[in-house]
């Protein structure tokens, strides 16, 4: 008699079987029904929920020549690469007329070697610095016990006796490998091997040893580097723009830094060819055979002022009786700082030299004492900054003033009543 025509009679003649296997297994669930008339679409349920995107195939075979004859319908659900999410109760479902029919259940179970949800990752750590590694595995079957290994040596006497999901490492002095084994009733699975590379610690106490107008001597304390000696340290310097705002933790300077390498020891470096009276930021990192440490924070430093590198230019000195008019121009050579003024010295053949501070003026009229008969009078001028005097000009002889020469009116500067100090060049 045709099946599926009576409300109480199930059309299913074959129900899904059971599958139990390890992860990755491929299997097929099958159910078969016999119906009269047009074959229905077979749906698959897992734990009572219709599988919308099931990998199923449906085969229909007529048992007679007439469409109203019986049909055999076979539906196969393919499970590829069995995962924990595939486990559960499977059933077939059909709608016939106004009725819904569900097959007897079949069961898909997972049971095999432990499966890793999380494995230790490669990383770099500073020498003697604590860090954590993670490992997580599951069955079924449960329980799953973990055993950590360092350089292939177990860190506990038996699985489950040592650290489990998280391994705390107080610090390493050499590059090491870590893995974990997951044990359950079915056997053992080994995780990937993570390589932990030991880099030097960040240098400490970056500071100045000396600061000169065009060079800085810098020193630092190296961090620990484990069993790997430091090969060199790298220092970066960058000009500090007023608006630059390199903060303690800011990762990169706004322009390409000047980079210098220092062989170590000593843990010092001289940075030369710098601009005087200029702010810089510096940082340092040290390298071993395993790689570089992290950079120190940017340290603000500043080169101090220097003395002018050359004497004033175009000095002219003319004399008219008891007055001498001297003028000059700013040095062409770098001032290496803020020009504070000029010093002028004059001396006759048999008279002590006289030193005067002229300030920022570039000309002066001297009121010479006596009748102006002092012979062979010469004048020297030097520029100065806060750092001191620059080089003195060569002595310039006073030329006699000739009528027709311009002789501007200037404030007279009286000669000091007592001579100042002597210079070795006289």
């Amino acid at each position: 008699a045709p099946r599926g025509t009576q409300a109480e009679e199930s059309p299913f003649v074959g129900n899904p079987g059971n599958i139990t296997g390890a992860r990755g297994l491929t299997g097929t669930l099958r159910c078969q029904l016999q119906v009269q008339g047009e074959p229905p679409e077979v749906h698959w349920l897992r734990d009572g929920q219709i599988l919308e995107l099931a990998d199923s195939t449906q085969t229909q075979v007529p048992l007679g020549e007439d469409e109203q004859d019986d049909w055999i319908v076979v539906s196969q659900l393919r499970i590829t690469s069995l995962q924990l999410s595939d486990t559960g109760q499977y059933q077939c479902l059909v709608f016939l007329g106004h009725q819904t029919f569900v097959s007897q259940p079949g069961y898909v179970g997972l049971e095999g070697l432990p499966y890793f949800l999380e494995e230790p990752e490669d990383r770099t750590v500073a020498a003697n610095t604590p860090f954590n590694l993670s490992c997580q595995a599951q069955g079924p079957p449960e329980p799953v016990d973990l055993l950590w290994l360092q350089d292939a040596v177990p860190l506990a006497t038996a699985p489950g006796h040592g650290p489990q999901r998280s391994l705390h490492v107080p610090g390493l002095n050499k590059t090491s490998s870590f893995s974990c084994e997951a044990h359950n009733a079915k056997g053992v699975t080994t995780s990937r091997t993570a390589t932990i590379t030991v880099l030097p610690q960040q240098p400490r106490n970056l500071h100045l040893v000396s600061r000169q107008p065009t060079e800085l001597e810098v020193a630092w304390t190296p961090g620990l580097s484990g069993i790997y000696p430091l090969t060199h340290c790298t220092l970066q310097a960058v000009l500090s723009d007023d608006g630059m705002g390199i903060q303690a933790g800011e990762p990169d300077p706004p322009e390409e830094p000047l980079t210098s390498q220092a062989s170590v020891p000593p843990h010092q470096l001289r940075l030369g060819s710098l601009h005087p009276h200029t702010p810089y930021h510096i940082r340092v990192a040290c390298t071993s055979s395993q790689g570089p440490s992290s950079w120190t924070h940017w340290l603000p430093v500043e080169t101090p002022e220097g003395v002018p590198l050359g004497p004033p230019e175009n000095i002219s000195a003319t004399r008219n009786g008891s007055q001498a008019f001297v003028h000059w121009q700013e040095p062409r050579a770098p001032l290496q700082g803020t020009l504070l003024g000029y010093r002028l010295a004059y001396q006759g053949q048999d008279t002590p030299e006289v030193l005067m501070d002229i300030g920022l003026r570039q000309e002066v009229t001297l009121e010479l004492q006596g009748d102006g008969s002092v012979s062979n009078l010469t004048v020297c001028v030097a520029a100065y900054t806060a750092a001191g005097d620059g080089p003195w000009s060569l002595p310039v002889p006073l030329e006699a003033w000739r009528p027709g020469q311009a002789q501007p009116v200037h404030q007279l500067v009286k000669e000091p009543s007592t001579p100042a100090f002597s210079w070795p060049w006289w």
Partner: antibody, heavy 117, light 107 residues
């Protein structure tokens, strides 16, 4: 182990030239600056001059022309001419603190130069 | 030349006292200052560099401070072993100048 030792100090008469030698051990003179300093009996320290890693020299103003510093791979010499009684002192040689040209952290015990008639 | 004026020329202290030695430069030397300790018959020993930094091996009771033209060496909790003469050294603009020295006598 690094060490510095001066030698050549002795009793001389005024006008006699004299060369002092600073012998270094375990010190790469292409890495470290070296300094000569003197100390008259009961007096303070007085810088004479420095020789830098590249062989360049710097002198105190009073020492220019009369004192000359030179070096080989293991020695630093101080040549002194026209010695006077004022030059009687213990002469020290010292190595730079790390690469510093200005700060000195390893000193020799000194050698005594006496200039007397 | 830069002149370094060191004061006092001599100071007496009891064990445990704090001693302060001052060094004044005739112009700004931008912290380019070192301090040395010298005991009779011995060479100087570096105590402080760049005004305030201690080389390794120097006890922390020695402290350097100052900037510009005024610098100070402070010895806290003076010990018998600290009896010596102390010198400041300026090294600004490639010029090395020592102060006149301060003798520390420990009672």
């Amino acid at each position: 182990c690094q060490s510095v030792e001066e030698s050549g100090g002795r009793l001389v008469t005024p006008g006699t030239p004299l060369t002092l030698t600073c012998t270094v051990s375990g010190i790469d003179l292409s890495t470290y600056a070296m300094i000569w300093v003197r100390q008259a009996p009961g007096e303070g320290l007085e810088w004479i001059g420095t020789i830098y890693t590249d062989g360049a020299t710097a002198y105190a103003r009073w020492a220019k022309g009369r004192f000359t510093i030179s070096k080989t791979s293991t020695t630093v010499d101080l040549k002194m001419t026209s010695l006077t009684t004022e030059d009687t002192a213990t002469y020290f040689c010292a190595r730079g603190f790390g690469i510093s040209k200005f700060v000195f952290s390893l000193w020799g015990p000194g050698t005594l130069v006496t200039v007397s008639l | 030349d830069i002149v370094m004026t060191q004061t006092p020329a001599s100071v007496e202290a009891a064990v445990g006292d704090t001693v302060t030695i001052k060094c004044q430069a005739s112009q700004n030397i931008y912290s380019n200052l070192a301090w040395y300790q010298q005991k009779p018959g011995q060479p100087p020993k570096l105590l402080i560099y760049f005004a305030s930094n201690l080389p390794s091996g120097v006890p922390s009771r020695f402290k350097g401070s100052g900037s510009g033209t005024e610098y100070t060496l402070t010895i806290s909790g003076v010990q018998c072993d600290d009896a010596a003469t102390y010198y400041c050294q300026n090294y600004y603009i490639n010029e090395i100048v020592f102060g006149g020295g301060t003798e520390v006598v420990v009672k």
